[in-house]
């Protein structure tokens, strides 16, 4: 079950794996949800009654009835993992810690001008998972305003000790707010021979790429495939770094694959969540239950529905055996991979779904595309909403897009001649605007927030955002769009589409079912040419076919342009302005969301 | 000692083409941060692409995407900038930069070795 609270002045007797360093028991809570196998915590504050080595202390622990003895102990406090619950969980951690000194190998100081500073260089430094910086009230002259970018082996502190006038943080990487470049070449036939930090068992050189983007020590890794000549070491994925991020040697072997952490391009794939079955494989490792099940679809879920399950192995039934049931095994290991990987005994293996709620909630595979056809099929746009209004009367204004539980991107020119958020109602997992009548659900908006530069739609910065007086539950017909990160802005998407409820010609009506279009990308300054008595800028991004025919039109306004990329759904444009629909040599023009990704941040995070 | 030494600036005309080379010594390109910068009287330099010479990514600021190409020949150690539908707001003294290790690829700050700069200029 899901315990969010914390147990003030409680320990967890026994069960423990390790101690690392955290600056609060909240943060405790996250690295206790992301290791392998913790499920339980006890953290000790700063505490007059405590010995202050033992400040800061985050015990990890695990118990086989996932929970422990407690026992009441003044400054501790205790918790459970997320792991047992449902809702999103993120490593994202932006909080300033203060007059804490979070210790570690100090690789790189320099002067910074603030905080803020200091945790953007760590934020854009490919080594740094931490800082401490020295304010100007700091007492030693020398030391004032100075940034010490930090790493450990671990990622967390090796020890935190009380100092005055400096403050702490982590690295912002895991919350998608990295310059660093996003390289996600993988390349065949190569070995980067560089130092090892750590080495697991994987089926794939993907499933290598995942472990090694949040593993906090590898920047790129090397994987050795089933046809590697070397028996002992097929499956081997080695997790690599080097001094100055990049491999210093590459070497060509046939059979081997290389490539490189995706830390800074995080939250346009999925990193925690191996979906794949791998057939013909078995994974080996602790054995935690033996369950018959009808499938390896069905064994994949009761390792997930299992707390302490990793990963699976299923064989199939043999004929007429046990009512067609194969057996299932439940296994799990010290660092979550299975501690060997071998072929050829007819077995079916994976890994639990439990993590992929560690990844943003927007990389979830969801329903192919229908191919062929304009009208959608229900969830096949999962982030599109119908935005009403209620005065005078219920009717369709908008569209718009779910980027967050509490969140929905839409066009500011929506809200022309709107007073008050009162008379908006977002409906959401709709494809026929004829499923809303009285009874329907929706969701209130508590607030819109309207880009402070927008003016007319044709001018730009035709963004708003609106906050909902409730979160959204997610379902596969109603879940968020994935941003595109600003590591991506090289990004040619190739298939994109537009959706809406809107016209399907200039003088038309809005439409009953929610409609797609595929349209093909422009460049700005193809637009600009279309476009000659605007100004095309780059926060505006153009679509449409040469010889017009598709487009948005009218009632579509504020909906999604949304582009596929590595096999992600992207929120690239809203839609927003163009001269009439579908004409000729007159492509649709859309907010260009990557560059308002800031501005989103700072708004829906500033709670 | 690493030098890198840019040619192919020049004056073009609105909607013309021009091709920067960077040819690199006591530096190798085949796995690195390598890329092209510019700065305009009065302006901070800025990034203009940036390639990572290992693979095929690359890195373009958004004033000049669709317009410019940057590309390398590993074999040659010589760095390019395919420039087509040059603006006069193209016009500036144009760099070429490597940078040692992982790097924010537009940010003129990570990078260590420069060139002396060619010249474009763009007139309407």
């Known amino acids: 079950e899901c315990v969010t609270q914390l147990l003030k002045d409680t320990c967890f007797e026994g069960g423990d794996i390790t101690t690392v360093f955290t600056p609060s028991a909240k943060y405790c809570q996250v690295v206790c949800t992301y290791h392998p196998r913790c499920l339980l915590f006890t953290f000790t504050a700063e505490s007059p009654s405590e010995d202050p080595t033992r400040w800061f202390t985050c015990v990890l622990k695990d118990s086989v009835t996932e929970t422990l003895p407690r026992v009441n102990r003044t400054a501790a406090i205790s918790g459970y993992s997320f792991k047992q619950c449902s809702h999103q969980i993120s490593a994202c951690n932006k909080d300033i810690y203060v007059d804490l000194d979070m210790k570690g190998i100090n690789y790189n100081s320099s002067v910074a001008k603030s905080a803020q500073e200091c945790q953007e260089r760590c934020t854009d430094d490919v080594h740094c998972h931490f800082f401490t910086y020295a304010t100007r009230q700091f007492p030693s002259l020398e030391h004032r305003n100075i940034c010490l970018l930090k790493h450990t082996q671990t990622g967390t502190p090796t020890r935190i000790t009380k100092l005055d006038k400096v403050v702490s943080g982590f690295s912002l990487k895991s919350c998608a707010l990295s310059n660093l470049a996003c390289i996600r070449d993988i390349f065949p036939n190569t070995v980067f021979a560089d130092s090892n930090i750590d080495s697991v068992m994987a089926p794939d050189a993907f499933v290598c790429g995942r472990i090694c983007t949040h593993h906090p020590g590898c920047l790129f890794f090397t994987f050795f495939s089933q046809e590697w000549p070397k028996e002992s070491q097929r499956n081997l994925c080695l997790l690599k770094t080097s001094e100055s991020g990049l491999p210093s040697t590459r070497i060509k072997k046939s059979k081997a694959l290389s490539g490189f952490s995706l830390q800074s391009c995080r939250h346009s794939i999925p990193v925690f969540c191996h979906s794949s079955f791998y057939h013909d494989t078995d994974f080996l490792g602790e054995e935690l239950d033996i369950v018959a099940a009808k499938s390896h679809e069905a064994c994949q879920k009761l390792c997930t529905n299992a707390v302490r399950c990793q990963f699976f192995t299923y064989t199939p039934a043999q004929a007429s055996c046990n009512e067609g049931k194969g057996k299932c095994y439940l296994k799990l290991s010290s660092n979550g991979s299975p501690t060997k990987i071998l072929h050829g005994r007819g077995g079916i293996s994976g890994y639990t779904l439990r993590l992929c709620k560690m990844d943003n909630e927007c990389t979830t595979k969801i329903k192919p595309r229908i191919v062929g056809g304009t009208a959608s099929v229900r969830g096949e746009w999962p982030w599109q909403v119908t935005l009403h209004t209620t005065s005078p009367t219920q009717r369709h204004l908008c569209g718009g897009s779910i980027i967050g539980n509490q969140w929905i991107l839409t066009a500011a020119h929506c809200f022309y001649g709107v007073e008050s958020p009162k008379i908006l109602r977002v409906y959401s997992g709709i494809l026929n605007q004829s499923e809303i009548k009285e009874d329907t659900s929706f969701f209130g908006v508590q607030e819109i927030i309207i880009h402070d530069q927008y003016k007319m739609a044709e001018s730009g910065y035709d963004i708003a955002l609106l906050k909902l007086e409730t979160t959204v539950n997610y379902t596969d017909s109603q879940r968020p769009i994935c941003l595109p990160s600003k590591g991506d802005r090289n990004v040619i998407y190739t298939d994109c589409w537009v959706t809406g409820w809107g016209y399907r010609k200039l003088r038309d009506k809005i439409q009953n079912t929610l409609q797609k279009a595929k349209i093909p990308l422009v460049t700005n300054e193809e637009c600009q040419k279309r476009y000659r008595g605007h100004k095309i800028t780059h926060k505006m991004i153009c679509a449409g076919y040469r010889e017009g025919g598709k487009d948005a039109c009218k009632g579509d306004s504020g909906g999604p342009l949304s582009c596929k990329h590595n096999e992600v759904w992207h929120l690239v444009g809203i839609t927003s302005w163009g001269e009439g629909c579908a004409q000729r040599e007159r492509p649709g023009v859309y907010t260009n969301v990557v560059e308002y990704v800031d501005w989103i941040l700072e708004k829906t995070q500033a709670v | 000692q690493v030098q890198l030494q840019e040619s192919g600036g020049g004056s073009v005309q609105a909607g013309g083409s021009l091709r920067l080379s960077c040819a690199a010594s006591?530096?190798?390109?085949?796995?690195?941060?390598v890329g092209w910068f510019r700065q305009a009287p009065g302006k901070k330099r800025e990034g203009v692409a940036t390639?990572?010479?290992?693979?095929?990514?690359?890195y373009y600021a958004d004033s000049v995407k669709g317009r410019f190409t940057i590309s390398q020949d590993n074999a040659k150690n010589t760095l390019y900038l395919e420039m087509n539908s040059l603006k006069p707001e193209d016009t500036a003294m144009y760099y070429c930069?490597?940078?040692?290790?992982?790097?924010?690829?537009?940010?003129?700050?990570?990078?260590?070795?420069w060139g002396q700069g060619t010249q474009v200029t763009v007139s309407s």
């Open positions: 930069a490597a940078a040692r290790g992982w790097v924010s690829p537009l940010d003129p700050a990570r990078f260590v070795y």
């Open positions: 390639i990572y010479t290992l693979g095929s990514s690359t």
């Open positions: 006591g530096y190798t390109f085949s796995n690195n941060f």
